[in-house]
């Protein structure tokens, strides 16, 4: 089974990430909840089902994350804009992989992400924004571990 | 290399709207702060607002809040500035500026856009 | 909002001087959040310093900006005919982004 190719630089996405990550966690007004962080769903997600699953959180910050958030801080909203420009990157790359019904999505790789909607659900829009960003690191660190799976052929 | 092509210069009646564009090339164009700054004759340089494509809101300057527009489409790498009514004093030339890596170190300049309100 | 105060208004100065310009904040912004633009007239304004004291690219290095918190200063070493035009220093903190009034450096 060939494996879906994801092009790139991760290093970047995190360099951004750590720039702004003390500045993001700040403003947390909910420090003992979690959106991703705890999530033992993530980490017992199957290599069939990472590629359905890493589309879904890419979805979930460009859609949902990145569009409510409100930044005043003009450099921090770049910051952001970058990381979220590799998202978008990413997502044209698992498009194609879908296309080639690569990344096909299984009741658990849905359940996964359901569960992250609906603890974003349980706060006040922009905590949950703060939030999820603030844990971009967890999203980003899941991504490393499951490297090989995702840009080996 | 970076360019911005504003369009031409527009003459308008106290009361209407402008709506001006300006089209980016060479470089990414979503994830990037277009500016729009305006200047007076004779006068120093005034902030009016900025977009960042990708999330498709603006931010505007107290000032200009209800009164412009900032979009910005993506397909075609365009923003667009829309004052609406016009008075005397909004005569100026319009530019439309884009970060070279931060939102505000406004690295590239459009020609700038000269608009005229006179009845 | 936070407000830039550009001093002099004018400086009048010869070629191969060396001119001193102020911007002031009116409450306290890292370095990295200043920069300074060149305007001639009839033209469209220039990046020269960003993050208060880096050179843009292509600026020559007799342009040169220091400070931080409320006091920013761009410095022209030595003044060439070209040089002379009007400078704005830019607060890019927070919304709004504000500029100076400008200075107007020309020549004595």
């Known amino acids: 089974l060939r494996r879906c190719l994801i092009s790139t630089d991760m290093h970047h996405i995190e360099e951004s990430f750590q720039e702004i990550k003390r500045a993001i966690q700040a403003k947390d007004t909910f420090p003992n909840v979690t959106i991703l962080s705890t999530l033992e769903t993530l980490q017992i997600i199957k290599p069939l089902d990472v590629c359905c699953v890493t589309k879904n959180l890419l979805a979930f910050y460009v859609d949902r994350v990145f569009k409510d958030h409100q930044e005043p801080n003009p450099k921090i909203l770049r910051k952001i804009s970058s990381i979220a420009n590799s998202f978008l990157y990413m997502q044209k790359t698992l498009r194609q992989c879908q296309e080639q019904r690569q990344c096909h999505c299984r009741q658990e790789a849905t359940n996964a992400t359901r569960v992250i909607h609906d603890n974003y659900d349980q706060l006040e829009v922009h905590a949950a924004a703060i939030k999820s960003l603030g844990e971009l690191d967890v999203f980003l660190a899941w991504i490393n571990k499951n490297h090989e799976v995702m840009f080996s052929a | 290399q970076v360019q911005l092509v504003q369009s031409g210069a527009e003459v308008k009646k106290p009361g209407s709207s402008v709506k001006v564009s300006c089209k980016a090339s060479?470089?990414?164009?979503?994830?990037?702060?277009i500016s729009w700054v305006r200047q007076a004759p004779g006068q120093g340089l005034e902030w009016m607002g900025g977009?960042?494509?990708?999330?498709?809101?603006?931010n505007y300057a107290q000032k200009f809040q209800g009164r412009v527009t900032i979009t910005a489409d993506e397909s075609t790498s365009t923003a667009y500035m829309e004052l609406s009514s016009l008075r005397s004093e909004d005569t100026a030339v319009y530019y439309c500026?884009?970060?070279?890596?931060?939102?505000?170190?406004?690295?590239?300049w459009g020609q700038g856009t000269l608009v005229t309100v006179s009845s | 909002e936070i407000v830039m105060t550009q001093s002099p208004g004018t400086l009048s100065l010869s070629p191969g001087e060396r001119a001193t310009l102020s911007c002031r904040a009116s409450q306290s912004i890292s370095s990295g959040y200043l920069a300074w633009y060149q305007q001639k007239p009839g033209q469209a304004p220039r990046l020269l310093i960003y993050?208060?004291?880096s050179r843009a690219t292509g600026i020559p290095d007799r342009f040169s900006g220091s400070g931080s918190g409320t006091d920013f200063t761009l410095t022209i070493s030595r003044l060439e005919p070209e040089d002379f035009a009007t400078y704005y220093c830019?607060?890019?903190?927070?919304?709004?982004?504000?500029f100076g009034q400008g200075t107007k450096l020309e020549i004595k």
């Open positions: 830019l607060q890019f903190k927070s919304f709004p982004l504000t």
């Open positions: 977009i960042i494509p990708i999330f498709g809101t603006a």
């Open positions: 500026a884009r970060d070279g890596g931060d939102y505000g170190d406004m690295g590239y």
């Open positions: 993050g208060a004291s």
């Open positions: 060479g470089g990414t164009f979503s994830s990037y702060a």
